[in-house]
């Protein structure tokens, strides 16, 4: 029997053991988070699967993910949302220490999909483990990109109070309009609920005295935010290692000086 023809995409294929990983993560999450104990993980997997299985992987819509989004509805307390751009690891290290603040990946849906890739094939129930569409080389409406756009939009929409964002000061564009933060989250913060956005600009390796809050791209971010009637604040985090240490031990005498 000849193998059926399969579309070749430029991106890597679905993460191995994808269904098992999603299901296992869901079970683990609901066990650790009492407020999500009511969630039926089989239903979550079915909704996740239903968003991309049998569908052409370059024609996925936010609508496809609505059943999953509905099942994973969660709220973050006001002032506790942490967005990030191009500095995921530090943001996650921070929320692991500062347990009352939350990134998207600390929420059920973000936790389920973090670092995973997936896609299906048109008119078959199979998962494509060989290749999936690349955002640049193939198409932007692929299952992974649309998922993150959908859940990022929702995460930003539900944020309230003072929202924080961690930005990578080592990049040429500290604020990048094309990032998920710049293209989705910034535009979906609700001025009626969000009083301010506070950026934390994380400095790179070498200790320097630049004020990255005056970086042109940060000024651009402030311009976008202020036009939406949201106040903007900014802090330089000159020493990320010390910053994390001080989050762990705020009483440490060295934490009284600047970080």
């Amino acid at each position: 029997v000849l193998p059926r023809w399969r579309q070749q995409w430029s991106g890597s294929g679905t993460t191995s053991r994808f269904p098992e990983t999603v299901l296992a993560r869901c079970v683990k999450y609901t066990e650790v988070h009492p407020e999500m104990r009511h969630v039926d993980c089989q239903s979550v997997w079915d909704a996740f699967k239903g968003a991309f299985i049998s569908k052409y992987p370059c024609n996925i819509t936010e609508e496809d993910y609505q059943p999953l989004v509905k099942l994973g509805t969660q709220t973050v307390p006001c002032n506790k949302t942490l967005l990030w751009s191009r500095i995921k690891d530090l943001a996650h290290q921070f929320t692991q220490v500062q347990r009352d603040m939350f990134t998207l990946e600390d929420m059920l849906l973000g936790y389920l999909a973090d670092d995973l890739t997936w896609c299906g094939e048109f008119n078959t129930f199979e998962i494509n483990y060989q290749s999936c569409p690349d955002w640049r080389k193939d198409c932007s409406n692929n299952p992974v990109s649309v998922f993150w756009k959908t859940v990022s939009r929702r995460f930003a929409e539900t944020a309230c109070g003072v929202v924080h964002v961690m930005l990578n000061g080592s990049r040429s564009k500290i604020f990048d309009k094309n990032s998920t933060f710049g293209s989705v989250e910034v535009h979906n913060l609700q001025p009626e609920k969000v009083q301010a956005l506070e950026a934390w600009v994380i400095h790179g390796g070498r200790e320097d005295s630049r004020d990255l809050c005056q970086d042109p791209t940060i000024k651009e971010l402030e311009s976008i935010i202020s036009k939406r009637n949201i106040r903007f604040f900014c802090k330089n985090i000159y020493r990320p290692d010390k910053f994390l240490q001080c989050v762990k031990n705020p009483e440490d005498s060295s934490c009284l000086s600047g970080i």
Epitope: A196, D208, S209, R210, D211, C213, Q214, D215, P216, K219, E222, S223, I225, S226, K227, R231, F232, F233, C234
Partner: antibody
Framework: EVQLLESGGGLVQPGGSLRLSCAAS????????MNWVRQAPGKGLEWVST????????YYADSVKGRFTISRDNSKNTLYLQMNSLRAEDTAVYYC?????????????WGQGTTVTVSS | QSVLTQPPSASGTPGQRVTISCSGS????????VYWYQQVPGTAPKLLIY???QRPSGVPDRFSGSKSGTSASLAISGLQSDDEADYYC???????????FGGGTKLTVL
Amino acid sequence: EVQLLESGGGLVQPGGSLRLSCAASGFTFSDYWMNWVRQAPGKGLEWVSTISISGGIIYYADSVKGRFTISRDNSKNTLYLQMNSLRAEDTAVYYCAKDNWNDYYGMDVWGQGTTVTVSS
Amino acid sequence: QSVLTQPPSASGTPGQRVTISCSGSTSNIRDNYVYWYQQVPGTAPKLLIYKDDQRPSGVPDRFSGSKSGTSASLAISGLQSDDEADYYCATWDGSLNGRVFGGGTKLTVL
């Protein structure tokens, strides 16, 4: 034409107060960081204060900290400098200046200045 | 006493090349962009060089900026009589958390 026009200067006694204004025109005021810089008679330029677009980020020179307050009203395209507890050494021409587009600390448009004299 | 050190005066004849120096430290010049302003007596300052060596449109290419370590320089070639003015370097100082100017250099065209 891009223009900045300062007003509000004058003669004031030590310990007194004054409020300077800077009216902006010819550019989108609400897209730019703004500054106050002063120049004492026969002396060099001294940076006084900087305010960000929405007013959430503000810097002051040590020499004016706690006495001067920078603010802005984007709906009126106006920058302000409230000066309290004035001293003789605050006597200077006060310039307002806008930050250069797509830049860090450069100031590309300056007003003609308003003179503040602190004397008894 | 300015944080950035400039010579109080400099001079040259028409057509000559003159260089004005600006000396600082790691917390200002080394880590941050340097700016140069020209101020003709009785008028407002004018931005001459930004981001170390960039010229705003309208500034002649006779003016050039450079930086090395904790020092910066402004070079003016083909000196002209209307270049007679005060020149100021400026940058950000991370220790002071503020913008800083040099004391200024008075350029005389002989």
